[in-house]
């Protein structure tokens, strides 16, 4: 094949090599950029900056090599459009530093920076950590800081990410209240800070105020949906990023729902309870307090992390006719109480009914939780005719 006369020549099925001296000063308009997985650049003294726009359209890029060139600056967001990048070789350039943000979000298996006049500062603390933790092949490079000795020996006691403290109201927050949160940011070289409010949706009207080092956030006219939602303050400096999440507890009264009994491996009277703080629960059977035992007890499903409502069952193991009757769930918290009742009929008397027999009643539960249970059966037996009546 004839030698390629262009600045950049194809290499394999999806590679490009740009090695003609001084032919590039940027990476705009590389041929076949959309499908490139490998880009090799060498001897490009005029290529001094690598920025976001340079790699736009290189979404498939896996390997990027820029060596023996004039690279002095790589923008923190330079690789935003190349999320699949796994090997990055920037050796023998003029780089004095490289932001932690540049490699954030990438899964780099290899990062080569040897042969650069690195300047030891807190901005390279992340790279020192990579060296300590054996990441990206960095330890093998024994990186040096220009005139300062090994990167590994750089003092780092003062190199910390920002420290955040979020102040939330001590007092109880009620539905409709306005809540002021304040985020105090401390640390050296603070660059940016802000709030992440993606979970809030319709939970409140949001107003931001202030700036570094003290950020304010007003949540106006809060709803009960604000419970269990994260409000996150973040801040960045040249060392890295810090986040602190808090939750605002919005008080609201207990509520309860009961549903028709269903037969599974055992019987279940399904319920849902809500309220903040979490309500205490009590069951009544035919108007008397139901004492929970291994045959009749409350179990909860795993709670969803971002909501206050709890779902569960009053679980009945092999109930008989004596368990037929009216079940009431009482839920109470300091802001109110609620109850719901349902009639359940599990079976007719399978033991021959005698009108003179006492009708036993299980007479104070703690609310309870969980999974699994009966012995593995050798055969399935259909229970006696079952009817369920809803009160």
């Amino acid at each position: 094949a004839a030698p390629c006369p262009d600045a950049c020549c194809p290499h394999g099925s999806s590679g490009l090599r740009c090695t003609r001296d001084g032919a590039l000063d940027s990476l705009h308009h590389l041929p076949g950029a959309e499908n490139l997985t490998e880009l090799y650049i060498e001897n490009q003294q005029h290529l001094q900056h690598l920025e976001l726009r340079d790699l736009r359209g290189l979404g498939e890029l896996r390997n990027l090599t820029i060596v023996k060139s004039g690279l002095r600056f790589v923008a923190p967001d330079a690789f935003h459009f190349t999320p699949r990048l796994s090997r990055l070789n920037l050796s023998f350039n003029a780089l004095e530093s490289l932001s932690w943000k540049t490699v954030q979000g990438l899964s780099l298996q290899e990062l080569v920076l040897s042969g650069n006049p690195l300047h030891c500062s807190c901005a390279l603390r992340w790279l020192q950590r990579w060296e300590e933790e054996g990441l990206g092949g960095v330890p093998e490079q024994k990186l040096q800081c220009h005139g300062q000795g090994p990167l590994a020996h750089m003092p780092n006691a003062s190199c910390g990410v920002p420290t955040l403290k979020v102040q939330v109201p001590n007092a109880s927050v009620d539905v409709g209240d306005d809540v002021l949160l304040r985020c105090q940011v401390e640390g050296r070289g603070l660059e940016q800070a802000g709030w992440i409010l993606t979970e809030l949706e319709q939970s409140a009207t949001v107003m931001k105020s202030g700036g570094l080092p003290s950020l304010g956030l007003t949540l106006a006219n809060v709803t009960s949906d604000l419970n269990r939602k994260n409000v996150t303050c973040w801040a960045e400096n040249d060392v890295g990023r810090a986040e602190v999440s808090v939750q605002v507890n919005v008080s609201f009264p207990a509520s309860v729902q009961l549903h028709t009994a269903v037969e599974m491996h055992h019987w279940c009277i399904p319920f849902s309870v809500d309220g903040q703080p979490a309500p205490s629960l009590r069951w009544l059977f035919n108007g008397s307090v139901l004492n929970e035992t291994s045959f009749i007890f409350t179990e909860f499903l795993e709670p969803a992390a971002n909501e206050t409502v709890r779902h569960g069952c009053l679980r009945l193991n092999q109930p008989t006719h004596v368990n037929n009757g009216n079940y009431t769930l009482l839920a109470a918290n300091p802001f109110g109480q609620a109850s719901a009742s349902i009639m359940a009929a599990f079976m007719d008397n399978p033991f021959e009914f005698n009108p003179e027999d006492p009708i036993p009643v299980s007479f104070s539960p703690v609310d309870t939780n969980s999974t699994s249970g009966d012995p593995v059966e050798k055969k399935d037996e259909t229970p006696f005719g079952v009817s369920v009546a809803v009160g």
Epitope: I296, T320, D367
Partner: antibody, heavy 115, light 108 residues
Framework: EVQLQESGPGLVKPSGTLSLTCAVS?????????WTWVRQPPGKGLEWIGE???????NYNPSLKSRVTISVDKSKNQFSLKLSSVTAADTAVYYC????????WGQGTLVTVSS | SSELTQDPAVSVALGQTVRITCQGL??????ASWYQQKPGQAPVLVIY???KRPSGIPDRFSGSSSGNTASLTITGAQAEDEADYYC???????????FGGGTKLTVL
């Protein structure tokens, strides 16, 4: 498969406190099961002592209630029995089991009350 | 009363059918469970609930209930069925459990 293993002193002095632990393996003590203690004096029948749920609910045999405490340690996946003011009549093999059906049992541990 | 009564001893010829009974007021309200215990071993659950057998229990074991009596029936008794058999159920109050005194089964 769930396995249960009792442990504790085999000899307790009269008027002392009998303490046993049941380690649960092959399953979580925080599942939808209760956990129970049963005892069997030498040459005699089985006697139910009490039961506990991981959330703290417990029930005891009325005849032993004043002397019995059953507790659960979720972090260690085990539950325990304490029986106070013991006499020779409390000498028995003590079993732990899974309630309500007692479908899994420990192998039992003999506790002798004697001075 | 919180009691379950069993016959102290029952015998059966090899291969024949035997019924072991358990009587008590609470059995009008609750199912009985049945346990087999061999010397020096922990009890083994053989029947629970409404005639339910755990995995591994032969189908010659069955349970039934009528009035205040629960029964364990072994159809075609085997030599290995020789053991003590205990019933249990919830007490009439529903708040605790009770065991019968046990029945020693001899297979002849």
């Amino acid at each position: 498969e769930v396995q249960l293993q009792e442990s504790g002193p085999g000899l307790v002095k009269p008027s002392g406190t009998l303490s046993l632990t049941c380690a649960v393996s092959g399953g979580s003590i925080s599942s939808s099961n209760w956990w129970t203690w049963v005892r069997q004096p030498p040459g005699k029948g089985l006697e139910w002592i009490g039961e506990i749920y991981h959330r703290g609910n417990r029930n005891y045999n009325p005849s032993l209630k004043s002397r019995v405490t059953i507790s659960v340690d979720k972090s260690k996946n085990q539950f325990s029995l304490k029986l106070s003011s013991v006499t020779a009549a409390d000498t028995a093999v003590y079993y732990c089991a899974r309630a309500p059906w007692f479908d899994y049992w420990g192998q039992g541990t003999l506790v002798t009350v004697s001075s | 009363s919180s009691e379950l009564t069993q016959d102290p001893a029952v015998s059966v010829a090899l291969g024949q059918t035997v019924r072991i009974t358990c009587q008590g007021l609470s059995l009008r309200s609750y199912y009985a469970s049945w346990y087999q215990q061999k010397p020096g071993q922990a009890p083994v659950l053989v029947i629970y609930g409404k005639n339910k057998r755990p995995s591994g229990i032969p189908d010659r074991f069955s349970g039934s209930s009528s009035g205040n009596t629960a029964s364990l029936t072994i159809t075609g008794a085997q030599a290995e069925d020789e053991a003590d058999y205990y019933c249990n159920s919830q007490a009439s109050s529903g708040n605790h459990l009770i065991f019968g005194g046990g029945t020693k089964l001899t297979v002849l």
